[in-house]
Interface confidence: low
């Protein structure tokens, strides 16, 4: 409770009557300060501490020559010591001091908890000059107080290089309990104990805590804040909150959902983005994670072929990104693909299966019986070969790629030619004379280029030296290709 009293502001000396003294001092200028007319300051007194002896700093003033008065020590007058009020109320408090007029440039500053209050604070200083002294009243007002306004406020005055400090005024803002720690949402394992924490502060203290589960109180008797609730285990989702009570009333925390971890839902929307002869790039949309992070996923692949043994290939991959390139697949084959993901509880069911196909592969064998010879005009090299026996998976033959490398002293260059699938011979122009020409041939399908045949070399002589003997690939079992010149 606070007593408020209003009284007329009458400037008065600290000690009435003349005092002996012999110190001489120049006293020519009076303190010239504005006077705010009609201002009736509100003075606050604490009834619990009437006439409390002053314990603050004092300044010893000098002696005036006029009348040879020795001035007593300066000190702030006692004022209200402790103000208790509710949040959002307005408060005003002040400190006052009477200063002999010999002193100039006196300023009063306000401090809170050891820090000066600067800037946009509502502080007003009013001056009431009289013949010998000026009464100074410094008021500080706060509109709609908050908890952050709690603290110890003092006035300071600097005079003659001395600092005069007032008694502290303690402001205590009381309100509903304020949460400093609220329960947090959690994902827990079924039938496993866990803790929830709730902490709230006043003032006023004490703050008592009640726990609420699914709208029903858990504890009959309140616990002093902070409170830890140990839940022995849950079998289904629950919502918990805590109530904080003090003399001002009740505050309820946010409700938090405690989820029970479960296996994930199966992935959905398995999509195929890219298909090659031996790989398929898939993506999927993860299912619900069952309140527990995904650990990894499993891509299951079955070959859709009446002749296959029905075995399932399993590829384990990380849960993110939701993409996987399935490799080591057969070319031109049909596959059924499903995805399953796991968390700490277990594996999800498999996604809906989708069908996908690999494309044609490249040939796996090179053309056979490659023969190379210089024709009669010696302007061309004639190349012949036999079509390779390609597997169905390699797809339809679209042509051949011929590599011919020309090497002589200081020269080496490779050229590539492409011919259609119906060809089994080709002619290439002689590029360099007195050089070796090395020929290799590969079959090409839409799936790519197959392996090149073993190299066949032929020597191209200088002009005027004729030889028609062919070079050819070796018969099966021979170690090196034959070179016939």
């Amino acid at each position: 409770a606070i007593t408020e009293a209003r009284e007329e502001a009458k400037p008065y000396p600290l000690f009435p009557g003349p005092l002996p003294g012999s110190l001489q001092t120049d006293h020519t200028s009076l303190l010239s300060l504005p006077h705010t007319s009609g201002y009736q300051p509100a003075l606050m007194f604490s009834p619990t501490q009437p006439g409390r002896p002053y314990t603050g700093n004092v300044a010893i003033p000098r002696v005036t020559s006029a009348g040879s008065k020795l001035l007593p020590p300066l000190a702030f007058k006692h004022t209200v010591g402790h103000i208790i009020l509710s949040e959002h109320k307005d408060v005003k408090f002040n400190c006052s001091i009477s200063v002999p007029n010999i002193y100039q440039d006196t300023t009063i500053s306000w401090w809170k908890d050891g820090k000066e209050l600067l800037g946009a604070h509502h502080a007003i200083t009013q001056f009431y000059p009289d013949d010998e002294v000026t009464a100074i009243i410094a008021s500080f007002s706060i509109t709609s107080v908050q908890r952050s306004d709690n603290g110890s406020y003092i006035c300071k005055m600097k005079i003659n290089n001395e600092e005069i400090v007032s008694d502290p005024i303690y402001i205590e803002v009381q309100g509903l309990p304020h949460f400093t720690k609220q329960p947090e949402s959690m994902n827990v394992t079924r039938n496993t104990a866990f803790n929830l924490t709730c902490q709230a502060v006043g003032p006023p203290e004490p703050v008592n805590i009640f726990w609420v589960q699914n709208s029903s109180r858990v504890n009959e008797q309140p616990e002093k804040s902070p409170s830890v609730l140990t839940v022995p285990g849950l079998t289904e989702m629950a919502v918990f909150s805590c109530e904080a009570h003090n003399d001002k009333g009740l505050t309820v925390s946010k409700g938090v959902q405690i989820n029970i971890k479960a296996i994930p839902s199966p992935p959905t929307e398995v999509s195929i983005h890219n298909s090659t002869a031996h790989s398929i790039l898939i993506s999927w949309v993860p299912g619900f994670d069952g309140y527990s992070p995904f650990r990894n996923c499993s891509v299951q692949v079955k070959e859709v072929d009446p002749l296959s043994n029905g075995s399932v290939m399993i590829f384990n991959t990380s849960a993110s990104p939701h993409m996987y390139q399935i490799k080591q697949l057969q070319a031109l084959a049909n596959y059924s693909i499903g995805v399953s993901c796991m968390n700490e509880i277990g594996w999800s069911a498999v996604s809906p299966w989708i069908l996908a196909s690999t494309t044609e592969g490249a040939p796996s064998v090179a053309p056979l019986n490659v023969t190379v010879f210089l024709n009669e005009s010696r302007d061309n090299v004639d190349i012949r070969w036999m079509k390779p026996l390609t597997k169905r998976q390699a797809g339809e033959l679209v042509g051949y790629r011929i590599s011919h490398v020309w090497q002589s002293a200081g020269i080496s260059k490779e050229l590539l030619e492409e011919v259609g699938q119906n060809n089994s011979r080709a002619q290439i122009s002689v590029q360099v004379h007195n050089a070796t020409c090395t020929v290799r041939i590969a079959a090409v399908t839409k799936g790519g280029v197959g392996p090149f045949s073993d190299p066949v070399k032929i020597f191209i002589p200088a002009h005027g030296w004729v030889d028609h003997a062919p070079s050819s690939t070796p018969a099966p079992g021979n170690a090196d290709p034959v070179l016939i010149i």
Epitope: I272, H273, N274, S357
Partner: antibody, heavy 125, light 112 residues
Framework: EVQLQQSGPELVKPGASVKISCKTS????????MHWVKQSHGKSLEWLGG????????SYNQRFQGRATLTVDKSSSTAYMELRSLTSDDSAVYYC??????????????????WGQGTTLTVSS | DVVMTQSSLTLSVTIGQPASISCKSS???????????LNWLLQRPGQSPKRLIY???KLDSGVPDRFTGSGSGTDFTLKISRVEAEDLGVYYC?????????FGGGTKLEIK
Amino acid sequence: EVQLQQSGPELVKPGASVKISCKTSGYTFTEYTMHWVKQSHGKSLEWLGGFNPNNVITSYNQRFQGRATLTVDKSSSTAYMELRSLTSDDSAVYYCTRGDLLWSLLLPGNYFDYWGQGTTLTVSS
Amino acid sequence: DVVMTQSSLTLSVTIGQPASISCKSSQSLLDSDGKTYLNWLLQRPGQSPKRLIYLVSKLDSGVPDRFTGSGSGTDFTLKISRVEAEDLGVYYCWQGTHFPWTFGGGTKLEIK
């Protein structure tokens, strides 16, 4: 001569679906991928998705995944684009455009060498 | 997604004069296969887009040789040596290197 002939303009209500067709001629339908591109009024172009009729593989721009479905009818060499749960933001001109002679929709390439004439979709109540 | 930026929204040119349209990408369009899949389209008023250039500088069949494409990495340019009336329309650059394929905002070529 390569030609892509699209179906006519559509006026549909919000929340409904639409299916636009693109009939091709002048080339082997299964040897090229087919793509769909959206052009909002006075705005730029946005790739919606692509379809490989050779191995029946689709690939979508993530912005349209789940709402767009691309299909083909190989017998008539026709591509289709269905868009569901329409809103006014879907009002635009939609083009079909031919892709590369490629076996992957995700491989880099020089797509979009031939374009349909465009189908205007208006979504309004 | 790769962002394609065409800084000029409109380009006013005189018939017979040269024109230059720029296009920047938010990341390099050089693919691991050594190719740069940067392409240019022209959309004439009231028509469908038409491909002009692919692989930065290769002209589509039937495209006049007054068109040239150049650039590498992230900066590309389409040049017209002498603008003709049939060249008017909106020019779009687009990239086919990084999935999903993305287009520039377009540059409108108009007569001064």
